[in-house]
Interface confidence: low
């Protein structure tokens, strides 16, 4: 930020008013009026170029020095050139001297030169040279200089003119401040600006009116240079949560916004299904039977539990059921749906019910799945059973209605047997098979049904209650057609897959393990 | 409404005094000169004084210096010509007129004017 | 002081253009202000600055100038517009002075 000037002293803007100490008096340094823009300006001017020896004085009125450290020094002047006047002048000069003096008091008309220090020889960068004096085409040199650090109260300026023909037309004395800056949504006060130029003042700013430093940032500072010049910010403040940054401030978010932390972010429009916000709003409450998960972002709109599953079927397949269902038609607005399978089992006879997760084997964990199909198996024949599909959402846990559907199914069969061929010889097929064990105590006997392959007017039957039966009688090198069966209480069981076993050629022989 | 009115005028003898004055009403008469400028019978206008805003500048026409103050009053508005010594060839219509811009003009507004009569 | 120099009259037909002038040393520094005055009235001021017309003066006036000649231009001279026109500048010379013209009576035929 550009630094700010306080003027301790302004010769033009002071009209000719300010009454200078010349010495000598009236030889010298004189005040002159002219007329520039239509107003009049003043001058202190001095020519005596023709005479030698000149030491001419001029001396501003004592300046009062406030809190001022380093003080800057700006003149504008004309100077003649000395080819101007005839024959050259040979005591005539192009520079004048800038002297300064500290004191704690006004010495008045009381003039003692030992008591000026210098500052500088102020030399001219162009000089006016008679053509352009006659044309009214004065060139005006600006200088600036600068003397600190000060300690008095006060102090005074001194011009010497050593023989030139000069015309003082501006002097302005003043000191250097930081000024008062909001940057970062941080304020910092006025400061004075040092004397030293190595030196960096470190100065404290103070968040804005609903602006805070961020957990873990630094607190602002900015440095204040000699030059007036705020230099390295460091730190920063941020508009609080339900505030934004508009320009230089922390504005409350209009009604219908919101925002939830302290950030650089602007406040956002309430997201669907939230009430309208009040001003200055961290939140937006969500609708009535809509809600916000604990981890759910504020800027996401409230949701709510889904429908039940759209549609679901049990497909029963012998002592196994598939179950295929569709999404709810109303997802509450999340895509986090999952499934949860739950399974109930009742005896047709007693109408007595219960629990079946225990007893029965899922294709996947029936809880948590995002498939919208899953293979209940072992089953129990003769048993109707109840499967509920529940629709669960980031929601669902904060109320206490649930999305369900149900669906149930009669297990009439055993699963089928699943058969293998043990081993075979030339006239004979050793079969076995299994179902699972919840099922055999109700099979009383299994029924083993088999016929040559393309001999579709003769069957073999066998009953047993084993789990293994060994086929004599057959022909050699011949496929025969294979099924076995659970024979219930209630009457026949499903059937099993037909299998197609070959016995031996007469070539091979013994009894080989397949 | 801006104007300036004059008062003041008449017929003195030479050697004598008068004292015009311009009241002026419709502008912040603090922030401008104001000036005096004069015009004998069947001639031109003449320029005779001028005063800064503030009062602490004055210049006058060589015609008159010395002899004519120039002088304001801005607590009530008014300017003032003081004329002391007065000429057979100061006779003339006085006029008061405000620099719009400046110290010089130019004469934005204008007195009605007052008839200054130097005669024995 | 500087001094201004005008024509003592000019005459213009209705509706005809007029050019006045005014030399002087001072406006090779500074423009020309001018004044119209009719019998028994205060001066009004017609054109200040590089070309400048307060509000209600017509359009008809305007001015100019070049080196140490200024013009006030009447376009289209109306019957109203018969009267004294000065020229009035700051003095260049250093005194402070502002100077007018000897004024410039302008008839219409």
């Known amino acids: 930020a550009q630094g700010k000037e306080v003027v301790l002293l302004d010769f033009a803007a002071a009209g000719g008013e300010l009454g200078w100490l010349t010495h000598p008096y009236g030889k010298g340094w004189d005040l002159m009026q002219n007329i520039m823009n239509d107003m009049p300006i003043y001058m202190y001017s001095v020519c005596n170029v023709m005479s030698g020896d000149q030491d001419n004085w001029l001396r501003t009125n004592w300046v009062y020095r406030g809190e001022a450290e380093r003080i800057f020094i700006e003149l504008k002047f004309t100077v003649r050139d000395c080819n101007s006047f005839p024959g050259g002048a040979s005591s005539c000069k192009e520079t004048f001297n800038l002297y300064y003096a500290e004191s704690d008091l006004d010495y008045g008309t009381n003039f003692q030169k030992r008591l000026f220090t210098k500052i500088d020889t102020i030399a001219p960068d162009e000089i006016t040279v008679s053509s352009d004096f006659e044309a009214r085409h004065v060139k005006l040199n600006v200088e600036e200089r600068s003397v600190g650090p000060l300690t008095r109260k006060g102090f005074y300026l001194a011009f010497q003119d050593i023989g030139a023909c000069v015309a003082l037309l501006s002097v302005r004395v003043y000191y250097k401040k930081c000024p008062e800056l909001l940057q970062g949504l941080a304020h910092f006060p006025e400061t004075i600006a040092g004397s030293d130029a190595p030196s960096l003042a470190t100065v404290a700013g103070t968040c804005v009116d609903h602006a805070v430093v961020p957990p873990g940032g630094e607190e602002p500072r900015m440095h204040c240079a000699v030059d007036g010049e705020w230099l390295v910010p460091i730190g920063q403040c941020l508009c609080q949560a339900g505030y934004e940054k508009v320009e230089d401030a922390c504005q409350a978010c209009s009604p219908g916004f919101f925002k939830f932390e302290a950030s650089e972010s602007p406040c956002l429009e309430c997201p669907e299904h939230t009430l309208p916000s009040p001003e200055g709003a961290t939140s937006c409450e969500c609708e009535e039977g809509f809600f916000r998960a604990p981890q759910d972002p504020a800027s996401m709109p409230c949701t709510r539990p889904p429908s039940a599953p759209h549609y679901l079927t049990a497909v029963g397949m012998g002592a196994k059921v598939e179950l295929r269902w569709t999404p709810p038609q109303d997802s509450g607005g999340r895509e986090d749906i999952v499934y949860s399978v739950t399974c109930e089992q009742c005896w047709p006879e007693s109408g007595e019910c219960g629990p079946c997760e225990a007893s029965v084997r899922y294709s996947e964990p029936p809880h948590g799945l995002t498939r919208t199909s899953v293979t209940v198996s072992d089953l129990e024949p003769h048993m109707n059973y109840t499967f509920t599909v529940e629709a669960r959402n980031g929601v669902s846990g904060l109320v206490t209605s649930r999305s369900f559907r149900t669906a149930s199914v009669s297990i009439n069969q055993t699963e089928p047997p699943k058969v293998r061929l043990e081993g075979r010889s030339t006239t004979s097929l050793s079969v076995s098979w299994s179902i699972p064990p919840p099922q055999q105590s109700r099979v009383w006997k299994y029924e083993v049904t088999y016929r040559k392959k393309g001999d579709s007017n003769s069957y073999n039957v066998r009953r047993t209650e084993g789990f293994s039966v060994t086929l004599d009688d057959l022909a050699p090198d011949t496929t025969y057609l294979v099924q076995v069966q659970a024979l219930t209480q209630e009457g026949q069981g499903a059937g099993s897959k037909v299998h197609e076993f070959q016995t031996l050629s007469p070539e091979g022989s013994g009894n080989l393990a397949v | 409404q801006v104007q300036l009115v004059q008062s003041g005028g008449g017929l003195v003898q030479p050697g004598g005094s008068l004292r015009l004055s311009c009241a002026a009403s419709g502008f912040t008469f603090s922030s401008y000169a104001m000036h005096w400028v004069r015009q004998a019978p069947g001639k031109g206008l003449e320029w005779v004084s001028v005063i800064s805003p503030a009062g602490n500048n004055t210049y006058y026409a060589d015609s008159v210096k010395g002899r004519f103050t120039i002088s304001r009053d801005n607590s009530k508005n008014t300017l003032y010509l003081q004329m002391n010594s007065l000429r057979a060839e100061d006779t003339a219509v006085y006029y008061c007129?405000?620099?719009?811009?400046?110290?010089?003009?130019?004469?934005?507004?204008w007195g009605q004017g007052t008839l200054v009569t130097v005669s024995s | 002081s500087s001094e201004l120099t005008q024509p003592p009259s000019v005459s213009v037909a209705p509706g005809q253009t007029v050019t006045i002038t005014c030399q002087g040393d001072?406006?090779?520094?500074?423009?020309a202000s001018w004044y119209q005055q009719k019998p028994g009235t205060a001066p009004k001021l017609l054109i200040y600055?590089?070309?400048n017309r307060p509000s209600g003066v017509p359009d008809r006036f305007s001015g100019s100038s070049s080196g140490t000649s200024a013009s006030l231009t009447i376009t289209g001279a109306q019957a109203e517009d018969e009267a004294d026109y000065y020229c009035n500048s700051r003095d260049s010379s250093g005194t402070h002075l502002t100077v007018f013209g000897g004024g410039t009576k302008l008839t219409v035929l």
């Open positions: 007129a405000r620099a719009s811009v400046g110290a010089t003009g130019p004469f934005d507004i």
């Open positions: 001072s406006l090779r520094s500074y423009y």
């Open positions: 600055g590089e070309n």
